[in-house]
Amino acid sequence: PEPPTACREKQYLINSQCCSLCQPGQKLVSDCTEFTETECLPCGESEFLDTWNRETHCHQHKYCDPNLGLRVQQKGTSETDTICTCEEGWHCTSEACESCVLHRSCSPGFGVKQIATGVSDTICEPCPVGFFSNVSSAFEKCHPWTSCETKDLVVQQAGTNKTDVVCGPQDRLRA
């Protein structure tokens, strides 16, 4: 018979014949032959493979390094990787949560638009005209300038995105 050019699902083509893939949690030891089945072996402790595969080495479980602010959210199995997350008060530094850092602060002139969570950093926004922030903070929003008029005062010094206005008494003409 003609050798196959394509194989069924969960099979792979090698040496002009279709061999069974190894199931999740197992690695390939030897390809099948005309007379023998594919030989697979279970992944060792702290290893995994999450798909039907022909890998000769299992993948290492991710290590949730406490020195990087990480802790185990879900322990790995022979078929799944360990899932890490950040300690309280820290957030992931990337999509795969490879490590964690303390939440970013918004510099003076910027306010917090969105407070950080375990998976996302602080989002800062520039203080618009009429608002200011004079501190570096991970939770403070931009504050509105003081309204001198409501205090029956006048603006003596204009505000900026980093400083509040300075109010002073109105100059009154003497009789």
Epitope: H57, H59, Q60, D81, S94, A96, R104, T122, I123
Partner: antibody, heavy 115, light 112 residues
Framework: EVQLQESGPGLVKPSDTLSLTCTVS????????MSWIRQPPGKGLEWIGA???????YYASWAKSRVTISVDTSLNQVSLKLSSVTAADTAVYYC?????????WGQGTLVTVSS | DIQLTQSPSFLSASVGDRVTITCQAS??????LAWYQQKPGKPPKLLIF???NLASGVPSRFSGSGSGTEFTLTISSLQPEDFATYYC??????????FGQGFGGGTKVEIK
């Protein structure tokens, strides 16, 4: 063994697309971010972009219009495509595991842009 | 992108010297900063991340400090194998549309 290996043509013509592949072993691409970095001869490191463990892509502002990073988890490969290349794109191109904490690097591959 | 300004660009020193390299970020990146060592013809090697945490197998003469926008790498007593180029790298990440990343320009540590 945990390792990375870049591969691709060492010579690319101006205005063509540079295509590189990074083949990984010993860890799962779905669990790590992968970055591409380049280094022009005699110069410093330049971040090109990254692909997250969940598939999100992140590009340096200079690269946004020209770069595509993709991943094929079944082949354990991450690819980089850089279009409309010029002589200024001549560099050693590295793939690395991670985002800021780049704890594992390939040996790098030199790509020369020349006609 | 995040701009990281490294200084000095070049540094001549002798074995046993204490060496300090600084890295300034254009915006607050918390402690999300790494330091790398690179030797000619080789890929960079991770020394420190985040900011002050030594990577596995890195000698204790290396130390890092700083947070926010100002960071420092110190080699307490320079050894012959430490003559190399050092890079800082840092950034932040919130989502695909809100992130920053970059490398410093490098500091070449040469033999005096």
């Amino acid at each position: 063994e945990v390792q990375l290996q870049e591969s691709g043509p060492g010579l690319v013509k101006p205005s063509d697309t540079l295509s590189l592949t990074c083949t990984v072993s010993g860890f799962s691409l779905s669990s790590y971010d992968m970055s591409w970095i380049r280094q022009p001869p005699g110069k410093g490191l330049e971040w090109i972009g990254a692909i997250g463990g969940a598939g999100g892509t992140y590009y340096a502002s200079w690269a946004k219009s020209r770069v595509t990073i993709s991943v094929d988890t079944s082949l354990n490969q991450v690819s980089l495509k850089l279009s409309s290349v010029t002589a200024a794109d001549t560099a050693v191109y590295y793939c690395a595991r991670g985002w800021t904490r780049l704890d594992l690097w390939g040996q790098g591959t030199l790509v020369t842009v020349s006609s | 992108d995040i701009q990281l300004t490294q200084s000095p660009s070049f540094l001549s020193a002798s074995v046993g010297d204490r060496v300090t390299i600084t890295c300034q970020a254009s915006e607050d990146i918390s402690s999300n900063l790494a330091w790398y060592q690179q030797k000619p013809g080789k890929p960079p090697k991770l020394l420190i991340f985040p900011a002050s945490n030594l990577a596995s197998g890195v000698p204790s003469r290396f130390s890092g400090s700083g947070s926010g926008t100002e960071f420092t790498l110190t080699i307490s007593s320079l050894q012959p194998e430490d003559f190399a180029t050092y890079y800082c790298q840092g950034g932040y990440w919130t989502s695909t549309s809100n992130f920053g990343q970059g490398f410093g320009g490098g500091t070449k540590v040469e033999i005096k």
